[in-house]
Structures are given as C-alpha cells and as structure tokens.
C-alpha cells in the first residue's frame, strides 16, 4: 500500500503536486508498512479496542489563515478518556483518586510503556530496531529521552506526508511558500506503540487557508461607549483604532507596513505608519469605514530582465508582473504583483490587506462632573450611618441610569454598589443620594449611562463623625 | 399642560391578548422615560414596566416579564404595553404615569379584566 | 406582601399632625429617593413628595417628607377632611432592578 491509499481520499493533480512542494515532506506515493502500522477503514471493529477505557479524540488546530510565504503551525493534541493521562516518562496512568465507570482501578497504568520496551529492545546497543521505524521505514530520531515518545503522527496534506513522534501533544510547521492559495486539507492519523508494532488510535482532520491578502482586524475602543462590539460608538470623542495583523510566524516582522484609511464622513485618506489611529466623528449617522494595510513581504523573484540593447535606455531593475488569472492555481493576488529586484535574490513583494466595518455614530453622554457634596442632616437616632447629596452635571445625551460603586481609599475593594433609573432634564443636573455606614474615607465611582453610552467620574471623599460642627470634604 | 390618556381596556380571556395605549401631551414626549403600573380592584399599587425615552431600555416586574413588552413612538407620543398570556391575576386599573424614578403625572387608568 | 412596609391605616382628627412610617431596606429606601403619593377615592394617584423630602408646585406645605436609614415618613399637618385618602410611598430597588410600593396607609380624618 501507498500513503494516498492509506491517509485520504483527497487526490491533489499532478500540478498540484509538483507545484505545493512542502520542505522536509515526502510524496504519498511511497509504500506504507501496513505490518508494522495495520490500516483500518472507518467503521472497523477493532477501533472499539485500540484503547483501553475508551476512544482517544485527537484535536487538530493551527493559526490559519496564513500569508502566502509564511509559516503554518498545526498542533494536535490527544484527549484520553475519563480519569486517563500522561506521566512524565511517557506511560498513560489513571488519575488518583478519579473515578470512571470502571471505578477506581487497581493498576496505576493504562499503558506502561516503559516497562515494554525495556522488555522488548533487546537489539544492539545503537538503540535501533526494526520496528522502531516510521510506516516508511524511516529509524526514528533519537533525540534525548525519544523512547517516552509513544505516539506516532503522520500529517498529510497536499499529496505529502510528514512523520513525527511525540507524546500527547505535538506541534508542526509548515511554510506556505509553495502552497497553493485557498483553502486545503490536513490530515492527521495517530499511532500508538503496542508491543512491535503499532496500532491507529485517532484520525482528524482539519481545513486551514493560505492566502496573499495579509489577514488584518481592527479593535475599536472609545471612551464611555457603552458596548465596544456592537460597532455604535458616540459623537465628538475618540475613538482608538487599533489594527491587529494576523502574523504568529513574524513573516511581516520586518515589513515597513503602511495603513490607509478612509472614515467615510469626507475627512479624506489618512496614511500612517502606526498600527493606531484616534478618529472623532462630528456628525451622527452610519458611515463606512475602510483600512488597506500594505507591506513589503519576502516573495519571489521575477526572471532576470533580457540583456540590455545598446540602442535602448537600460531598463528598470523593478519589474511588474501581472498576477496570475484567479482561475490558475499557484500563488495568485488581486492587485499586479510589485516585485523589485535585489542583487542577492532576496525579493519583495507588495501584500495588501483589507478592512471594512459599518459604523453607526450616536448622541451619548460625553462627560460626567460632581460639583457638590452635601451632607444631608437627618433627624436622630440614626447616629451611625451619613447620607450625601451629590450634584452631578453632565454633558451629551440625557442619561437615563446611574451607578455609584463606593470603595476603599485605593479604589480596589468595592464595598457597595446601587444602580438606579434617573429622570433628568435637559439641563444635566442632578442630584444622586446614597448611605455611607460609619465615618472614614472613601472612594466614590459614580457612573450615568445611557442605551449607548457610560461615563464615569471618581471622587475621594472624606465622612465625618455625626458631629454637626464637622464638614463634608472632597478628600481629593 | 401635562395629559395622558389611556386606552385599550376591557374584557380578555385567559390566555388572551390585550394592547394598552398611552396618548401624551403638554410635554416634550420624547425626552422623558415611561412607566405602567396597575391596581387590582381593592388593593395596593403594582409597578409594571418602565421605557427610556430612546426605548433602548426597558425594566419589567417579575410578574410580567416575558408576557408584558412595554414600547413608544416618539413621532406619536404614544406608550404602548403589548399584554400577552393574561392571567386573572392580570385584573387591575392600568395606569400610564411619566418619568420612572418618581411617577410625577398619572393618566386616569384603563381597565383591563381578565375573566372566563 | 409589599418590600416596602407601611401601616394599613392611620387617623386624626381636623388640625392634627399625622405621620406615616415608611420601612425599607438599603437597596431600596436606604440609597435610593423616595416618594409619597395620593390617592384620594376613586381618582388616579397624585405625587405628594419627591426626593425624600421634595414637595412638586401646588402640593401645599403642610406636607413633608424626611428619610432616616432605611426609613422614611411622611407627615401631614393641619390635618383637613380633604386629606382623606391613600397614601403610598415608593422607591426603586437596586437589588430587584424594579420599583417598588408600601401596601398603602388608609388615613382617615375623625
């Protein structure tokens, strides 16, 4: 048998094959050691037993989407059943004192590798055997402490295939340079040692996407914006774009990455360097907003420029190639791909990436004052608690609730916190009472909000003793 | 000077469906949060829902809540209270009052009984 | 049951001080306003105080309102036969997210 035959169904063409060529990865036209590593269909029997206690489910990730050029990394990761987990020398024990439906079990191991192979290596001091290969025969790696590596991962994507041994989690990174763009499929089988031979305990698999658009989102935060997600932010304060580039392999660490945006209320383009950008709207509506992010990407070379005429000016050395038609496959772009030319074959290409949000601008309270304090006399006995007025101004829209969290001096330990609806007039003034429970000094977050917006003002303030003769002070 | 007057009373059956209407003058509608509440013949006063004068918040008795949706047109100066799945308990004078942290005006109240 | 606590009924005779107990808790009476509210016999109900102690225009002096704790009274001087009425106090509650009555205090004018 063949790796195709064994690891998917999915056929990549001949140009595909010959075009996706993934480095350190072998065609899945070798031969697979079907003695060595038995291949079950889905369905076969001998799944149900080929683990003690229960099924394994292997969990495959990666970071997808990539830039075209950049590093993909898949992890995948082995849940075992109930009361079920790796040592540190590799051996699958039951957790102490977990019960599963076999209750608690008398032997602490599920696997006890170790014991195994110590019992069955009986080979030549080189530590090698037959039957420590990989299902192409390859010897494994004899990396330290490589024998309390029980699992046996076999990646295929792309008509290759990739072996790893590890232990109940692994990771693998692949560069997208010869990828084709769009969307492909990984596949992972997993193997366990059993004995001399091994046998399949999971398969998955995974879609991820390789692409030349650089994959960008933007977080937006404005002050006393109520809900940050729901793309309504206020009238006449900033707001904080921040754009995050999807790059965990830092392919575009050494990019001078250029951001251009439109706010969709005629302000114009705005270029900048900065990955945040403060923007304040001016008018209420919905507006359209858009971002393209550009960064000079390692990429490939275009072919050398023909020898110069000595009729003809020399040409540029920055040639322009027009992209690939979106129908072929094989690294395509939107955009003419910009290539410039640079004496050592290191190339740049010009990657483009894109935003776009609906936003809807609102009336909202934009600033909150407190610009009184009042003790409140109240009629005795009720020696051991003050009441305060606090007048309170605002600007913006009409708030309609108002929260006063009362805390220690440092403003960390909340002690008290009463939310109630407001009526307030067009004037913004009001006046919010609350109970303060003995003298001392306090902390005093008073809150307005409305449907969309939340503002806040912090005072220090200082009770005194129920002595009429001792004022209220603004400790602050 | 400040009316509101309440309509949409009457005669339902358990299980129906009534809608209340709040028409309101001498005030500037659409600055001022809304409120419901109700009294059973011979008792106490029962506070029902209260509106923000955006209608992007709405707070509801726990008697009410998910029957009752209380909501307003701005252009026509009218709070409404949607009553579904009524209950004989449902039985009261439902007045419409303005503002929501003191009821400073009352309408004259609509009744609304809930009988087989 | 009310989650404020007011009693049934209260009586005076014409040009005597009443007051009415108010009793709550600090979700509601004790950090929030209170108002008092009238309702004489088969009419609407009429704010009476706001505030704590609050009077609106066209409720006469004879009126007040005051708040100690987590309670809060009304008193009614010069008592007159008009005077004759329900009387409620309410505030909203911070922990029950609602706003909320006294059972009502049945006054009556001996």
């Known amino acids: 048998k063949r790796f195709h035959d064994v690891l998917g169904n999915e056929r990549p063409s001949a140009y595909m094959r010959e075009h996706n060529q993934l480095n350190g990865w072998s065609s899945d036209e070798n031969d697979w050691n079907e003695k060595l590593y038995p291949v079950w269909k889905r369905g076969d029997m001998r799944w149900k037993n080929s683990w003690k206690g229960g099924r394994v489910q292997a969990v495959l990730t990666s970071d997808s989407p990539a830039l075209v050029g950049s590093n993909i990394t898949f992890a995948v990761n082995l849940i075992f059943p109930r009361c079920q987990k790796e040592d540190a020398n590799g051996n699958i024990v039951y957790e102490k004192n977990c019960r599963n439906e076999a209750g608690l079990s008398a032997d602490p191991y599920v696997y006890n590798w170790t014991a195994w192979s110590e019992d069955s290596d009986g080979e030549n001091g080189t530590g090698q055997s037959h039957h420590n290969v990989f299902p192409d025969g390859k010897p494994f790696p004899h990396h330290p402490g490589w024998r309390r590596w029980n699992f046996i991962y076999v990646f295929h994507t792309l008509g290759q295939y990739f072996q790893k041994l590890g232990r109940c989690s692994v990771r693998v990174s692949v560069n997208t340079a010869n990828v084709t763009l769009g969307p492909q499929l990984m596949e992972v089988t997993v193997y366990r040692r059993h004995g001399r031979a091994y046998v399949p305990i999971a398969q998955v698999k995974d879609v991820y996407v390789v692409t030349d658009q650089i994959p960008v989102f933007v977080t937006m935060f404005q002050k006393n914006d109520r809900n940050s997600s729901d793309e309504t932010f206020l009238k006449d304060l900033p707001i904080m774009f921040d754009v995050l580039i999807h790059d965990p392999s830092h392919f575009l660490n050494y990019s001078t990455i250029n951001y251009k945006w439109s706010f969709g209320d005629n302000t114009g383009l705005f270029v900048s360097t900065n990955h945040t950008v403060n923007h304040t709207y001016v008018l209420n509506g919905t507006f359209s907003l858009n971002l393209t992010v550009k960064a000079a990407a390692p990429g490939p070379c275009p072919p050398p420029p023909p020898p110069p005429r000595p009729s003809k000016p020399t040409p540029s050395l920055a040639t322009t190639l027009k992209s690939y038609d979106s129908n072929t496959p094989g690294p395509a772009g939107d955009n003419p791909l910009e290539l410039s030319r640079i004496p050592d074959e290191n190339c740049q290409i010009n990657r483009y990436g894109h935003f776009q949000a609906t936003i809807t601008i609102v009336e909202g309270i934009l600033e909150v004052n407190i610009i009184q304090m009042t003790d409140v006399l109240m009629p005795v006995p009720w020696p051991e608690s003050s009441l305060i007025d606090f007048v309170v101004t605002c600007q913006g829209s009409i708030p309609t609730e108002v929260c006063t969290i009362i805390s220690d001096p440092t403003c960390e330990i909340t002690q008290n916190t009463v939310c109630s609806p407001v009526d307030v007039d067009e004037m913004c003034l009001l006046t919010v009472r609350r109970t303060f429970n003995g003298s001392g000094t306090y902390c005093v977050n008073l809150t307005l909000g409305d449907d969309t917006s939340l503002a806040l003002t912090s005072t220090l303030i200082s009770v005194p003793d129920r002595d009429p003769a001792s004022p209220l002070r603004m400790a602050n | 000077e400040v009316q509101l007057l309440e309509s949409g009373g009457g005669l339902v059956q358990p299980g129906g469906s009534l809608r209340l209407s709040c028409a309101a003058s001498?005030?500037?509608?659409?600055?001022?949060?809304m409120s419901w509440v109700r009294q059973a013949p011979g008792k106490g006063l029962e506070w029902v829902s209260s509106?923000?004068?955006?209608?992007?918040?709405?707070y509801y008795a726990d008697s009410v809540k998910g029957r009752f949706t209380i909501s307003r047109d701005n252009s026509k100066n009218t709070l409404y209270l949607q009553m579904n799945s009524l209950r004989a308990e449902d039985t009261a004078v439902y007045y419409c009052?303005?503002?929501?942290?003191?009821?400073?005006?009352w309408g004259q109240g609509t009744l609304v009984t809930v009988s087989s | 049951q009310s989650v404020l606590t007011q009693p049934p009924s209260a009586s005076g005779t014409p040009g005597q001080r009443v007051t009415i107990s108010c009793s709550g808790s600090?979700?509601?009476?004790?950090?929030?306003?209170v108002s008092w509210y009238q309702q004489l016999p088969g009419t609407a109900p009429k704010l009476l105080i706001y505030?704590?102690?609050q009077r609106p225009s066209g409720v006469p002096d004879r009126f007040s309102g005051s708040k100690s704790g987590t309670s809060a009274s009304l008193a009614i001087s010069g008592l007159r036969s008009e005077d004759e009425a329900d009387y409620y106090c309410?505030?909203?509650?911070?922990?029950?997210?609602?706003?909320?009555f006294g059972g009502g205090t049945k006054l009556t004018v001996l």
């Open positions: 509106i923000s004068h955006s209608g992007g918040s709405k």
């Open positions: 001498g005030f500037t509608f659409r600055k001022l949060n």
């Open positions: 505030a704590d102690s």
């Open positions: 600090s979700s509601n009476i004790g950090n929030n306003y």
């Open positions: 009052a303005r503002k929501w942290s003191t009821f400073d005006y």
């Open positions: 309410g505030a909203w509650d911070s922990s029950l997210n609602a706003y909320v």
